[in-house]
């Protein structure tokens, strides 16, 4: 029985060239987190494994940093980074939980700076 829920930063925006933290939080379950995967539109960005720590996909090593926590930091943002991001929690005994974040990368200072998880 899957009782947990994933809280995410929801829809967020950031400026081109800047950085952003993608955060998900699994709550309302005592399930053990085995692994968290971060994906961008079906491309695996990074894995945080409970045993082995972080693995960043080679093609994203220059622009993706692990953390904070189980979150993911995207750096040197480009307009092409606009889109959906998913955190996938593999847990036991519950199974798989998925959270969605939509990131919009803006050309100028139109980006909202009030987002709690944003890096100035």
């Amino acid at each position: 029985m899957m009782t947990g829920t994933i809280e995410t930063t929801g829809n967020i925006s950031a400026e081109k060239g800047g950085s952003i933290i993608l955060q998900c939080h699994l709550s309302s379950t005592t399930a053990q987190v085995t692994q968290v995967n971060w994906e961008q539109q079906d491309q695996l960005l990074a894995i945080c494994n409970a045993d082995l720590g972080w693995h960043i996909s080679p093609s994203f090593k220059d622009r993706v940093a692990p953390g904070p926590g189980l979150g993911l930091t995207l750096q040197s943002l480009t307009v092409n980074d606009t889109g959906e991001y998913f955190c996938i929690y593999h847990t036991y005994p519950d199974g798989t939980y998925t959270g969605r974040i939509f990131l919009e990368v803006l050309e100028s200072s139109v980006a909202e700076h009030g987002a709690r998880f944003q890096i100035p």
Epitope: Q32, T34, N49, A50, L52, Y92, G95, T96
Partner: antibody, heavy 119, light 107 residues
Framework: EVQLVESGGGLVQPGGSLRLSCAAS????????MSWVRQAPGKGLEWVST????????YYADSVKGRFTISRDNSKNTLYLQMNSLRAEDTAVYYC????????????WGQGTLVTVSS | DIQMTQSPSSLSASVGDRVTITCRAS??????LTWYQQKPGKAPKLLIY???KSHTGVPSRFSGSGSGTDFTLTISSLQPEDFATYYC?????????FGQGTKLEIK
């Protein structure tokens, strides 16, 4: 080339014990979640047990919980399944399998080893 | 436990045919559905994961689709080496359960 080679199967009496081994090569063994899956003669596939890369976390099907123990020795690139209190319904070909790094599917399987529980 | 039901259980087809196998989950499994191929006396082989992603080296004639509870595996043009048993497996929640299999035979 990824290779998984199981051994240790055989004929055992009900209530007996057996230890299966799976020798892995061709990949960084310690980085991957591993599982045992079984297939009774003429039947479908049944997930048995899973172990995390470092061996810290282990998961079992209800049908084997308390009787089977999965373990791994990363220095020897070997996965194990200790099977105790064996029953006739445990008769099956046992496969070891490697998961994708993403943990989305089992991408490589061994050839299997047959365990027969009979008096 | 999540029950996985495949249909048909067996299927006769000819080389060159387009074949579709379906898999239904007893509850929502999102896209956490995998397809395996198994030949007699051999280990299963991964074909499709995450409902529609092809594993490395799998011929393009194999494709997967679906989400939620209903999934399909399609072989666009059957080849002689495709005659085998196909299994679906859910990865939404433990225990990870398999369908009963679909045996694809030569007509």
């Amino acid at each position: 080339e990824v290779q998984l080679v199981e051994s240790g199967g055989g004929l055992v009496q009900p209530g007996g014990s057996l230890r299966l081994s799976c020798a892995a090569s061709g990949f960084t063994f310690s980085s991957y979640i591993m599982s045992w899956v079984r297939q009774a003669p003429g039947k479908g596939l049944e997930w048995v047990s899973t172990i995390s890369g470092g061996g810290t976390n282990t998961y079992y099907a209800d049908s084997v919980k308390g009787r089977f123990t999965i373990s791994r020795d990363n220095s020897k690139n070997t996965l194990y399944l200790q099977m105790n209190s064996l029953r006739a319904e445990d008769t099956a070909v046992y496969y070891c399998a490697k998961w994708l790094l993403s943990y989305y599917a089992m991408d490589y399987w061994g050839q299997g080893t047959l365990v027969t529980v009979s008096s | 436990d999540i029950q996985m039901t495949q249909s048909p259980s067996s299927l006769s087809a000819s080389v060159g045919d387009r074949v579709t196998i379906t898999c239904r989950a007893s509850q929502n499994i999102n896209v956490w559905l995998t397809w395996y191929q198994q030949k007699p006396g051999k280990a299963p082989k991964l074909l499709i994961y995450k409902a529609s992603k092809s594993h490395t080296g799998v011929p393009s004639r194999f494709s997967g689709s679906g989400s939620g509870t209903d999934f399909t595996l399609t072989i666009s043009s059957l080849q002689p080496e495709d005659f085998a048993t196909y299994y679906c497996q859910q990865g939404q929640s433990y225990p990870y359960t398999f369908g009963q299999g679909t045996k694809l035979e030569i007509k």
